[in-house]
């Protein structure tokens, strides 16, 4: 679809003369029609294919016309098509005398015909006009011609149809030619396909208009390049959604179980040495001068009595010091300087010469001991602590401290490692002699029913078009993660691409 | 050749949500070169575009609805579905689903037969 | 809003052209569709982007649009083309249909 467009310049008549070379009464009052039509190597008459069109009466005899685009659009002369524009064309312009104001051809005589002249030839689409001048013996007309497109047609013969649009069905622009040219941030045949943000992952983003990035399930980020881990992870990472892949130290399946106690919470205290032992559990080797299970108690080194023969202790910082009783010296005061004549055995201890009497020993009564029976027997010398107890004596009593898993006065009673619910998952728990068991439900396994092992929902392979399947470990099923080109719970569905123009 | 059909409850009460699936068959609902709408003909009246949208789950509303319409897609299933809220008398009418081609400039090439829903207590 | 204005009703005799305008604000630059549908029946896709015909559709039906005109063209009328016709173009990001016109 287009339009010829006929831009008369001036017409010269200067003898105002018909063609008959009659002059016109009292002059040439001149209109003219123009016929468009296919090309004939010689133009003839015949029907005006490509279109009609008469002007009013421009002017007497010899005038120059006006353009009057602007108001009314009489000229240029518009000769509008509804076809592809062929390239060539057939052009009759007659010059009519109009004696009165009826301009049809019936109501004029036939000799009111002033001149006609007929060209032939090509004509490409264009804005430039062409200038033309045709010259007869008694007139002259000069006049300028153009093919245009119609509003919405391009190309080279205006059969292009293309309406600029920005709406989900394109955001487009037309070229010269009639292709489409995408508005900024907007791609594809129709100009419908937004660009996503820059570095938006392929795969795993999409987006709905320009520089958005959208994350398919199990990934997430500005740009989508970021995976979802197992929901509940702790201190563990993913490289593919829904993993939880356990940072050092920790264990389990979230990630939450603490495999590395020692470092993350230093439990020993003064100086002592921590090791790892299991799942949140840990031994301390104290440095000398502490007890505990942490170390945190500081051992005095006069609790174990090292002075003999009524010898008093007293702590220091590198260890401790005997005063001893008179006749008695030595690191612990066991050497004596009394005879049994000195009555150095107290508390109802009998003496006895030794080496001629150069020495004694005493024989104490129950519940005395020592050198010189000036102990009271120490409750713990007959170990009465049970399953490896350390046994304190404190004054004129003694205390048992009990090692993990016992209990009682003695550290008789054995503690059930059940009694904390170690089996995780359900698992029944079972106290042993030196620990415990745990027997797990379908779908557990582990020392404590920590690992599940139910069915993988992988293993039937359930993407289509070489997906990646991931199992969704807190409800048993999978997500699978498309590759360009498909969509779908199962990748099942391929992106069509768009046909091409029907033009 | 593709099919689509519509299935939902034919008589919704005043001031409830109207629930309206499209099931596409004989082709994907994920290609790229269609939107999927929803239109709708009261008895005796004219057409009336409801919304549409993309496989992407993009949406676009008949401003004179939008407040009281959702419209979503299942690619797992290929349908897509309408939700009107708050329905009247005013909102009796048939309603199709149509596959609206970007290469037809956004024209419907393919109509469901269209399913009567009358909003009445 | 957007509207779209069609004639009620065109009558036409078996054999003659029918016309059916539809008339919108610079309609000429929007792309328009036409919808054939008879009583009963689902609408039928016969003109898009003013003057394609989909595949099926008879060379009889044609359009054109320019200006605030749209048209839809039945050459040689035949009884079977007695139906309901609407226009249909796109506001921004809005369909817009129109009133119709009963072709009998």
């Known amino acids: 679809s287009g339009v010829f467009q006929l831009q008369l310049q001036e017409f010269i008549n200067e003898r105002g003369v018909l063609a008959s070379g009659r002059p016109c009464e009292p002059g040439c009052r001149t209109f003219f029609r123009v016929c468009l039509k296919h090309f004939q190597a010689v133009v003839s008459p015949g029907p005006c294919t490509f279109g009609t069109v008469s002007t009013p009466v421009l002017g007497t005899n010899s005038f120059a016309v006006r353009d009057d685009s602007s108001g009314g659009g009489r000229n240029p002369l518009q000769l509008p098509f509804n076809f592809t524009w062929p390239g060539t064309f057939s052009l009759i312009i007659e010059a009519w005398h109009a004696p009165g104001d009826d301009l049809r051809p019936e109501a004029l005589p036939p000799d009111a015909l002033i001149s006609k002249i007929a060209i032939q030839g090509s004509l490409a689409v264009g804005q430039n006009w062409l200038l033309d001048e045709q010259t007869s013996t008694l007139t002259r007309l000069r006049y300028s011609y153009r093919v245009i497109c119609s509003d919405n047609y391009y190309g080279d013969n205006c059969s292009r149809l293309c309406k600029k649009r920005n709406d989900h069905f394109g955001h487009y622009v037309c070229q010269p030619d009639g292709n489409l040219s995408c508005l900024p941030g907007w791609t594809g045949e129709y100009c419908q396909q937004p660009i996503c943000l820059s570095g938006c992952h392929e795969q795993n983003g999409y987006c709905s208009k320009p520089a958005e990035c959208l994350c398919r399930p199990g990934w997430q980020g500005r740009l989508c390049n970021e995976c979802i881990p197992h929901n509940g992870c702790r201190h563990g990472t993913c490289s593919t959604p829904w993993q939880c892949t356990c940072d050092e130290g920790w264990g389990g399946l979230f990630c939450d179980q603490d495999l590395n106690y020692c470092t993350h919470h230093s439990p020993c205290k003064n100086g002592a040495t921590c090791s790892n032992s299991g799942q949140r559990s840990y031994t301390c080797t104290c440095r000398p001068g502490y007890t505990g299970v942490d170390c945190e108690l500081e051992l005095s080194e006069c609790d174990s009595n090292p002075c003999r023969n009524g010898g008093s202790c007293k702590d220091q910082e590198d260890g401790y010091h005997c005063l001893c009783p008179p006749g008695y010296y030595g690191l612990h005061c066991e050497h004596s300087t009394l005879s049994c004549a000195d009555s150095p055995c107290f508390n109802g201890g009998s003496c006895r010469e030794r080496n001629q009497g150069a020495n004694y020993a005493c024989e104490c009564p129950p519940n005395f001991t020592g050198s010189n029976c000036e102990k009271k027997v120490d409750r713990c010398t007959s170990n009465p602590c049970a399953n490896g107890g350390q046994c304190l004596n404190r004054g004129p009593s003694r205390m048992c401290r009990c090692r993990p898993g016992f209990t009682g006065t003695y550290c008789e009673l054995h503690v059930s490692d059940c009694a904390r619910n170690p089996c995780a998952h359900g698992g029944t728990c079972h106290d042993l002699e030196n620990g415990l068991m745990c027997t797990c439900p379908a779908g557990f396994s582990g020392r404590r029913c920590e690992v599940r092992t139910s069915i993988d929902a992988c293993a039937s392979s359930p993407c289509f078009n070489r997906a990646t399947c991931y199992t969704d470990l807190s409800t048993d099923t999978f997500v699978c993660n498309c590759p360009y080109g498909f969509v779908g719970s199962r990748c099942e569905f391929p992106v069509g691409l768009p046909p091409s123009f029907p033009w | 050749e593709v099919q689509l059909q519509e299935s939902g409850p034919g008589l919704v009460k005043p001031s409830e949500t109207l629930s309206l699936t499209c099931t596409v068959s004989?082709?994907?609902?994920?290609?790229?070169?269609?939107?999927w709408g929803w239109i709708r003909q009261p008895p005796g009246k004219g057409l009336e575009w409801i919304g549409d949208i993309y496989y992407t789950g993009s949406t676009y509303y008949n401003p004179s609805l939008k407040s009281r319409v959702t419209i979503s897609v299942d690619t797992s299933k290929n349908q897509f579905s309408l939700k009107l809220s708050s329905v009247t008398a005013a909102d009796t009418a048939v309603y199709y689903c149509?596959?609206?081609?970007?290469?037809?400039?956004?024209?419907?090439?393919?109509w469901g037969q269209g399913t009567l829903v009358t909003v009445s207590s | 809003s957007y509207e779209l204005t069609q004639p009620p009703s065109v009558s036409v005799s078996p054999g003659q052209t029918a016309s059916i305008t539809c008339s919108g604000d610079s309609l000429g630059d929007k792309y328009v569709s036409w919808y054939q549908q008879k009583p009963g029946q689902s609408p039928v896709l016969v003109i898009y982007e003013d003057s394609e015909r989909p595949s099926g559709i008879p060379e009889r039906f044609s359009g054109s649009n320019s200006g605030d005109t749209a048209t839809l063209t039945i050459s040689g009328t035949q009884a079977m083309d007695e139906a309901d016709y609407y226009c249909q173009a796109w506001d921004s990001e809005t369909g817009v249909f129109g009133s119709g016109t009963k072709v009998t």
């Open positions: 004989g082709g994907s609902i994920s290609s790229g070169s269609y939107y």
């Open positions: 149509a596959r609206q081609a970007v290469m037809y400039g956004g024209g419907s090439d393919n």
